[in-house]
């Protein structure tokens, strides 16, 4: 027993004065604590603790389960201990079969021996299976066998404590090791949708999925730039060893405009943190915004095709779409489709396909769209470019030559005189009068131009050309002159 200098309190003395005692099963354990300030005896083995206030601890018929550490404590809190082994050939090990290990830490297989004189105290795999090659252990007859630096791969490992007793190998009850994983990566977080658009009063619900190796991962929904605690509902699953999933659902039962903002799902473990955000936009009512993909004033050549294309944002989703021309609704020739298949898509495309347009098909084409809250429309003014057509070319009673041409854009009419039989008319003739006849008529379609010249100016035989042209093309008509004496005998118009 330890000795201390006089004046200082000393620990109690135990009789027998040894650190270890071996008792045969059925024999008596008699331990005496010698100390004027004796307080108690304490017995400890595995998770069991017993106390005795008598200074002599007597167990008349010792059993294997009486194996353990007996500690005597005095009033100064000083103590001395003796470890008693109760040797029982039928019960070599005391066991507590609960076995948990933290990854990368040591863990104790609690199988203390009742006989310290056995040999080859070690661990064995169940059913003769070998232990993992890298498993290292340290035996201690009084405590059990410590597995060093537990690996995740040891999870659910089946083990026995083993020792050789009188030349025979004895196995304890089996242990199944459960490994608590260490965090070696940040949690994996994902969100059901990256953005939400709602009308005031609608329910906002968003789910964050957190995946990690263990349920001790921390997660929370936070509102950016706010400390308010948000109401969450959790569901969680253990999908297998080291495969834990939690769903954290955030709900605002009746969203308001001022609930708009960025919400963050944050998760962390001892390794680090991860987050993902979702954006909520709450509007007081629905909307439709239309964006033309081409100019709303369209010029197209006669006989060609044109596609009128709009993109539009609609929330809530569009219910009715139509294309209209001259109060007539198109039943075909158009298509309407979402811009993306994304669940949160609010952008759509509508296309009207106009084919082989005629000059008479210019006009206003209107796209109309509506949802449960609003209507919206956009108009396209379509002008069909047509080559001039000469409608009339006549000699009037007053001696004027008149040419009337129609086309779009507005044709220009030029006059030329060709003396004799020349086909190339180069000498231009200035018109006397030029009028646009339907300038105040409908805004689309062909424009009609009338031009006149005075035929009395021509003194020789020849041909007069009326040439109507615009950006699209040109058309000519001809007048032939023949003189007899001083009289213009004939004027033959031809194209």
């Amino acid at each position: 027993q330890p000795s201390v200098s006089p004046g200082e309190p000393s620990p109690p003395s135990i009789h027998p004065a040894k650190s270890e005692l071996i008792v045969r099963v059925g024999n008596e354990i008699r331990l005496l604590c010698i100390d004027p300030g004796f307080v108690k005896w304490t017995f400890e083995i595995l998770d069991e603790t017993n106390e005795n206030k008598q200074n002599e601890w007597i167990t008349e018929k010792a059993e294997a389960t009486n194996t353990g550490k007996y500690t005597c404590t005095n009033k100064h809190g000083l103590s001395s201990s003796i470890y008693v082994f109760v040797r029982d050939p039928a019960k070599l090990f005391l066991v507590d079969r609960s076995l948990y290990g933290k990854e990368d830490n040591d863990t104790l297989v609690r199988c203390p021996l009742t006989d310290p004189e056995v040999t080859s105290y070690s661990l064995k795999g169940c059913q003769g299976k070998p232990l993992p090659k890298d498993l290292r252990f340290v035996p201690d007859p009084k405590a059990g066998i410590t597995i060093k630096s537990v690996k995740r791969a040891y999870h659910r490992l089946c083990l026995h404590c083993s020792a050789d007793q009188e030349g025979k190998s004895v196995l304890s009850d089996k242990f199944i090791l459960k490994v608590r994983p260490a965090f070696k990566a940040v949690p994996v977080v994902s969100v059901s949708k990256a953005s939400y658009l709602l009308r005031e009063g609608e329910e906002f619900t968003v789910t964050c999925t957190i995946k990690d190796v263990s349920s001790s991962v921390y997660s929370t929904w936070k509102r950016e730039n706010s400390q308010t605690k948000l109401q969450e509902k959790y569901n969680s699953w253990h999908h297998g060893d080291f495969n834990y999933e939690r769903q954290a659902t955030l709900t605002i039962s009746s969203a308001r405009v001022n609930d708009s903002g960025v919400f963050m799902c944050y998760a962390n473990n001892t390794f680090g943190s991860a987050n993902v955000t979702t954006t909520l936009e709450v509007v007081d009512k629905g909307f439709i915004n239309i964006f033309p993909m081409i100019n709303t004033t369209v010029f197209v050549n006669d006989g060609e095709n044109v596609d009128l294309i709009v993109e539009y944002e609609a929330f809530p989703k569009p219910e009715h779409q139509q294309w209209i021309y001259m109060n007539r609704t198109f039943t075909d020739k158009w298509e309407d489709y979402p811009k993306s298949e994304n669940e949160s898509n609010i952008r759509y495309v509508s296309e009207l396909h106009l084919t082989r347009l005629k000059g008479t098909e210019g006009g206003t084409y209107t796209f109309l769209v509506s949802n449960s809250d609003v209507n919206a429309s956009i108009a396209f003014n379509v002008y069909v470019n047509t080559k001039p057509e000469i409608l009339t070319y006549d000699r009037l009673v007053n001696g004027m030559l008149q040419c009337v041409a129609a086309g779009f854009p507005e044709p220009t009419i030029d006059w030329y005189f060709c003396p004799g039989t020349e086909q190339r008319c180069s000498a231009s003739v200035l018109p006397v009068d030029v009028q646009t006849l339907n300038a105040s008529g409908p805004p689309f379609g062909k424009l009609v131009v009338q031009s006149s010249i005075d035929s009395s100016a021509f003194k020789h035989n020849g041909t007069v050309e009326c040439k109507a042209y615009n950006d699209v093309g040109k058309t000519s008509a001809y007048f032939n002159f023949a003189f007899k004496g001083n009289n213009k005998e004939q004027i033959h118009p031809h194209t």
Epitope: D47, S215, S216, S219, S236
Partner: antibody, heavy 119, light 107 residues
């Protein structure tokens, strides 16, 4: 020795409040998720609530969500259940239980504390 | 939520009998199934976890089997101290749910 000891039960009127405590000993409290499980007289077991070892995350049965709050003080090795807006159907023995290996296996239970909600 | 259905709700047996209690989950819970024993006026006690692993200190006459949705608790030779109510519990997902219980009575 690993032990859980509940306290705080008693008779309370409908709409009233009560706070249950569970004192833990014999293990590293902060390493374990903890739970409350209840048992109405003559009925089966019903899980009520859970809290992770750090106290960071809490989980509730739908029947108590919004009325009950689970919390823990790891420095005091104590688990709590704050029960508000109590109803007659909350009458039960309330047990605290330790989650073993983080997988919601209840390996250690307290002896229970009786909560009676009656006018 | 996962529903747990236990059968029978009660049974009478004699000491030495082999007793089987079944538990069915409303969806697959893999092997995340635990069994508890409860005696009147006492807290429940864990017997078996992960469908078949015997909790430390539980006699080997208790055994568990099954996976997916169907599970069984077997007491190979009923002892006087085994007369009690037995509950199954799924630990696959939160909310955690228990079966309704099976009361084992003396015949």
């Amino acid at each position: 020795e690993v032990q859980l000891l509940e306290s705080g039960g008693g008779l309370v009127q409908p709409g009233g409040s009560l706070r249950l405590s569970c004192a833990a000993s014999g293990f590293t409290f902060s390493d374990y998720s903890m739970n409350w499980v209840r048992q109405a007289p003559g009925k089966g077991l019903e899980w009520v609530s859970a809290i992770t070892g750090s106290g960071g995350n809490t989980f509730y049965a739908d029947s108590v969500k919004g009325r009950f709050t689970i919390s823990r003080d790891n420095s005091k090795n104590t688990l709590y259940l704050q029960m508000n807006s109590l109803r007659a159907e909350d009458t039960a023995v309330y047990y605290c239980a330790r989650s073993n290996y983080e997988q919601d296996v209840f390996d250690i239970w307290g002896q229970g504390t009786l909560v009676t909600v009656s006018s | 939520d996962i529903q747990m259905t236990q059968s029978p709700s009660s049974l009478s047996a004699s000491v030495g009998d082999r007793v089987t209690i079944t538990c069915r989950a409303s969806q697959t819970i893999y092997r995340y199934l635990n069994w508890y024993q409860q005696k009147p006026g006492k807290a429940p006690k864990l017997l078996i976890y992960d469908a078949s692993d015997l909790q430390s200190g539980v006699p080997s006459r208790f055994s568990g089997s099954g996976s997916g949705t169907d599970f069984t608790l077997t007491i190979s030779s009923l002892q006087p101290e085994d007369f009690a109510t037995y509950y199954c519990q799924q630990s696959y997902s939160i909310p955690i749910t228990f079966g309704g219980g099976t009361k084992v009575e003396i015949k």
